[in-house]
Structure formats: C-alpha cells, structure tokens
C-alpha cells in the first residue's frame, strides 16, 4: 500500500513538475527590465528564451522573437538545448510512469517488469528536473554577469561611442517558477526510486537453519540442497524443503550400510 | 552592425531653433526605441527625448514644451526639433538606438555639439 501511494505520489509531483518546465519555457519573463536607476520609463522589456516583449507606457504591448539563431549568444542557446531536453526526458518518463503504476493494470505485466519500468521512470524525472534546475542557474548566471557589467557602464560615461546596454535585467517570474518545478520533477524521481525498490518482487529468504543427522555429519548446501556423499536417500540433489526450512525432526537420517567406513 | 549618423548642430542664440537629425543604417531589431541624449562638460549623461518603435514619447523634465521629437520609421530616422533655446541647453547632443533584441543593445552616435550663446 505504501508503495502504491509513493508510487503515485511520485507521479502527480513529477507530472506537475514537468507542466512547470513546460511553462517555464514558454514564459516570457525569463528576464525583466530593472526599473531603479533608469531614466526611461516609457518602455518595459521582459524577455523569454524565443522573444522579447515592450509594454509602453501607453499600454500597447508587442512581442518579437529572436529570429536570428547566430547573433544570440551561445549561452542562451544552451539554456535552450538544456531546457527541452528536460521537457522531452519528462515527457518520455511520464508515458513510461504511466504503464508503471501499480495501480494499472497491463496484461499480465509481472511484477518486476513494472518495478524496472518505475525505475526507468525515476531516472528520467531526476535528469529531467536536473537539466531544468541547470537551465534556469545558467540564465540567471548570465542576468547577474550583464547586470554588474552594465552597471560598470552605466558610470564610464560617454567615453566609448559604442557602449553596452544601459538597461539592466533582473530575475524574471519564470526563473522562479523553473527552480520550483525542477525541483517538484527531482523530487518525484527520487519518490519513483524509492517506489521501485518495494515493487521488485523480493528472493525468497529462508531461515538459516543447521541441519544435522544423528550419527553422520551432513553439510548443507545455500541453494536449498542437501549434499550427500552420493549414496544416500538424495542422490539426486532434489530440493528437500520448499517454502521454508524445515526442523530437524522433519528431516530424518536413517543409518544406512554405508554409514560407517 | 548599425552606424549612426547625425548632423544639425551648431551656434544659435538664446531662444532661437535648432533641428537635429539621426540616420541609423544597418538591420535594426524591430523593438527599439531612438533618442537624444546630451552630456555638458562635468555633467553626467541626460535624457533628452526618446521616441519608441511602438510610438510612445518621452522628454528629459527639463526640455519639456520646448523641444519635439519625432521619427521616421521608414527611413530609420529621427529628428529633434529644438526652441526656444536657453544657455544651459549647452552641450554635445547624442543620438542613441537602443535595441530589445536578448539583453538589448546600445548603439551610439558621434555626437553634435550644440552652443547656445549671445
């Protein structure tokens, strides 16, 4: 039961996790414009992974997107790269996930197929919310870098004619919401392989018992046999106990001829 | 890479007209805003007027109701109508582009000295 709830459990936190990498993505507000310190204030800029949005101080908002892929640089196109991946590894790790439930029932899908499958799944879901908690770290490496740079500029003066940007970029609304989700989608991996180790059907584990006839020394064997020289009433190596260890009483040596040499 | 051009300064008296102009050649990303700026001798940078892609407007409290800003979309221009021109309006007048492409641009003009005195 524990099992089936952690199970699940690790699905519903994974797949909110994932609708918040999906999000993330297509947000526009990755990077929002730092209003302190800026003269300009007829125009707002927020930017996204695939456009950059104005809001005037009208309150027209337009929205275009970075139709050259060799002018944006390369970081972004990492944060990109790191991003989707993240989405297709959840979105393959949910459809996985989805036959892995113990609370579905596939067929005659035994146990331990359901078990590597939730396994699979886990792994899927940690890289997943890894890649997305990556992603976001390198954008908001990159935001806090042209901040301080810009802020350099901000006081040069009008010294070089080409300057960099003076409008500075802060943490936008889908970082946030990257770190969160990333997060939710590690945690249900971790929730998934932790679920996986009660599916796997367990070896039977039988009890550590000496057996002992009387009057001859008789080994025993950890694959469940009983050794005997050959002669005796197991020549065959047949299992002598299933489900379970047997006493001493229930396994009885009678002295044979060949008892004594 | 876009080169700015600007041209229409000089000496004017107090109170008399000037009209700046900015050409930017080169492939512009579609939301931008062009403006002026202007730096006197000891100063720090100062906003003039911007004009944005989108048609919104803004002035430097100090200009207000006496310098027009406008913008040609067509020909990636803009011009600064400036009157009635007080001493204190002294000052090397930038032309400035700045582009919201990822993390915006700024491109900057030579500047055009603009005095005004008796």
């Known amino acids: 039961m524990a099992v089936t709830a952690c199970q699940g459990l690790g699905f519903v936190v994974s797949l909110i996790g994932i609708a918040g990498i999906i999000a993330a993505t297509c947000m526009d507000q990755w990077s929002t414009q730092d209003l302190y310190n800026n003269p300009v204030t007829a125009v707002f800029n927020y930017q996204g992974l695939w456009r950059s949005c104005v809001r005037e101080s009208s309150g027209f908002t337009e929205c275009r997107g970075y139709f050259t892929l060799l002018g944006l640089p390369a970081m972004l196109q990492a944060v990109r790269a790191l991003m989707i991946v993240g989405i297709v590894l959840g979105a393959i790790g949910l459809l996985v996930s989805i036959f892995a439930l113990k609370c579905i029932r596939i067929g005659s899908m035994e146990d331990s197929a359901k078990a590597n499958m939730t396994l699979t799944s886990g792994i899927m879901f940690i890289v997943s919310g890894l890649c997305a908690i990556a992603g976001v770290s390198v954008f908001a490496n990159m935001l806090v870098t042209n901040f301080w740079m810009s802020t350099a500029n901000m006081y040069t003066g009008m010294g070089g004619m080409v300057q960099t940007v003076q409008t500075r970029y802060t943490f936008g609304a889908a970082l946030f919401v990257g770190w969160v989700a990333g997060g939710l989608t590690l945690i249900g991996g971790v929730m998934m392989c932790i679920a996986c180790r009660g599916l796997a059907p367990e070896e039977t584990n039988y009890k550590a018992v000496s057996y002992h006839a009387s009057g001859h020394s008789v080994a025993y064997k950890p694959g469940g046999f009983k050794a005997s020289t050959g002669f005796g009433s197991n020549t065959k190596n047949k299992k002598i106990y299933d489900g379970g260890a047997r006493t001493e009483d229930e396994v009885q040596s009678y002295p044979s001829k060949h008892d004594y040499v | 890479e876009v080169q700015l051009v600007e041209s229409g300064g000089g000496l004017v008296q107090p109170g008399g007209s000037l009209r700046l102009s900015c050409a930017a050649s080169?492939?512009?990303?579609?939301?931008?805003?062009m403006g002026w700026w202007r730096q006197a001798p000891g100063s720090q940078r100062e906003l003039v007027a911007i004009a944005t892609s989108g048609g919104s407007i803004q002035y430097g409290d100090s200009v207000k109701g006496r310098f027009t800003i406008s913008r040609d979309n067509a020909k990636n221009t803009v011009y600064l109508q400036m009157a009635n021109l007080k001493p204190e309006d002294t000052a090397v007048y930038y032309c400035?582009?700045?582009?919201?492409?990822?993390?915006?641009?700024?491109?900057w003009g030579q500047g055009t000295q603009v005095t005004v005195s008796l």
């Open positions: 080169g492939s512009i990303f579609g939301l931008n805003f």
């Open positions: 400035n582009v700045h582009t919201y492409d990822f993390l915006g641009r700024d491109y």
